[in-house]
């Protein structure tokens, strides 16, 4: 199809080489109130279309995205770029930053219901650049946390080095929906609830003498509880002795509860004490068996192929640790009578 009638939007993605960040393009097809665009090539101002333009009666998930190769080849279906670029509803997600994402992206309705819809398309020219270190040393992260129940704020990474006074007007989106009341480079949240979690996008316009660009950044906002003040506790084993049968295989499970920590480095391991000696045992990987907002339960098993007489003289110790401290629970094996 002919893309010369598409409206054009220029976007700039300045990515940090330090962090793993993503980027999005929205298919900003004209809405009924902007219908002059879809119809501008077809109708004089006096003519009235017999139906609303495409976007008037359909939802935005029904769009098709294309990539325009720089060498002038025909348009390519964006699905060819899977899994580096993924379409979800009207949004195109770029999973890996890089200048190779620079180029032209076109979106248009999947269903062309009338001749008027042919020109209903948007061409987005995306320029991708690595961030220069000099531009801002303390720019806001693309992953930000909000503490549940407290006040907090979400900063636009590309503007976080500017004061509120000198900051341009910002357009914010949350999970693809426009947040019409927010216009500053920072969203202030009076009290943080779980629903504040989501993918936020901030846009502002940057102009030079030749043209203007929309500078865009994506922020993943997580709602979290405060870091735990407690060391982990061992839920199992509870008893310090365990009845066993000699010659039989045995699995002893250690289950521990770790409170939430932003930087989470849980330790759970088994070691054996035999008189004055003690050594760590190589056991299967630990696994998370339950995860909630406040804590996580992690399990690690020690497996004995068969219980020997020597095992009865040993102590099997489960050791768990977080940044606050550690806890141990030892188990002595006792022959079943």
């Amino acid at each position: 199809f002919n893309i010369s009638g598409c409206s054009t939007k220029k976007l700039l993605w300045t990515y940090s080489t330090r962090s793993e960040e993503e980027f999005v393009l929205f298919c900003d097809l004209p809405e009924p109130q902007k219908s002059h665009f879809c119809h501008r090539n077809r109708l004089s101002p006096k003519q009235v279309p017999e139906h609303l333009p495409f976007m008037g009666s359909n939802d935005l998930s029904d769009v098709q995205w294309y990539q325009q190769p720089s060498n002038g080849d025909p348009l390519e279906d964006i699905r060819k770029s899977y899994p580096h670029i993924i379409q979800d509803k009207c949004t195109l997600h770029f999973l890996t930053p890089g200048v190779n994402n620079s180029g032209s992206y076109i979106c248009r309705p999947k269903m062309i219901k009338s001749p008027y819809d042919v020109a209903c398309c948007v061409k987005m020219i995306l320029e991708v650049k690595p961030q220069t270190n000099a531009s801002c040393e303390y720019s806001a992260s693309h992953k930000q946390d909000l503490l549940l129940g407290s006040t907090g704020s979400i900063s636009c990474p590309s503007l976080s080095c500017q004061s509120d006074a000198q900051s341009p007007a910002v357009t914010w989106y949350k999970n693809g929906k426009l947040l019409s009341v927010e216009r500053s480079n920072r969203i202030v949240v009076d009290e943080v609830y779980d629903y504040h979690q989501g993918t936020y996008v901030c846009d502002y316009t940057q102009s030079d003498t030749v043209s203007s660009w929309t500078v865009r950044a994506v922020v993943q906002v997580r709602t979290i509880v405060g870091d735990t003040k407690l060391k982990p506790d061992i839920l199992d084993p509870v008893e310090d002795t365990l009845e066993v049968e000699l010659g039989k295989p045995l699995t002893i499970s250690c289950k521990a509860r770790f409170g939430f920590e932003r930087v989470f480095n849980p330790v759970i391991k088994w070691y054996i004490k035999d008189s004055d000696l003690e050594w760590e045992v190589s056991v299967p990987e630990a696994k998370s068996i339950k995860s909630t907002l406040k804590d996580e339960i992690i399990e690690r098993n020690i497996i004995l192929e068969k219980v020997t007489q020597r095992d009865l003289r040993r102590k099997f110790v489960c050791f768990v640790q977080n940044s606050i401290g550690n806890t141990t629970q030892s188990v002595q094996l006792k022959e079943k009578r």
Epitope: S61, Q87, K89, T199, Q220, T223
Partner: nanobody, 117 residues
């Protein structure tokens, strides 16, 4: 923290079918994410096999197109992968994960799928 738990793996004969399930622990996170199924065959890199957006749009890697169907149930916080006409080269550990969203990079423990010829 987001926990993802897969199930449904196992041993199946070539030409057979399997349905993998993945349950997430938090709904507020789940519904706005692009969820996906990854797989890792022995000695190979992990690859994204299929993904599904919050609006239901799906994508598949070429090797499973026409044989795999990914679906989701936001109310149950669950994502599924139906695999038909299985081939020995589909043998791998299959992981459910967040492809796009707040917990991007979160993966489950994995479920082993073995296809015997």
């Amino acid at each position: 923290q987001l926990q993802l738990v897969e199930s449904g793996g196992g041993l199946v004969q070539a030409g057979g079918s399997l349905r993998l399930s993945c349950a997430a622990s938090r709904s507020i996170t789940f519904s706005h994410n692009v969820m996906g199924w990854y797989r890792q065959a022995p000695g190979k890199q992990r690859e994204l096999v299929a993904s599904i957006g919050s609006g239901g749009s799906t994508n598949y890697v070429d090797s499973v197109k026409g044989r795999a169907t990914i679906s989701r149930d936001n109310a149950k916080k669950t994502v599924y992968l139906q695999m038909n006409s299985l081939k020995p080269e589909d043998t791998a550990v299959y992981y459910c994960g967040v492809v796009v969203g707040v917990y991007r990079g979160s993966l489950g423990q994995g479920t082993l799928v073995t296809v015997s010829s």
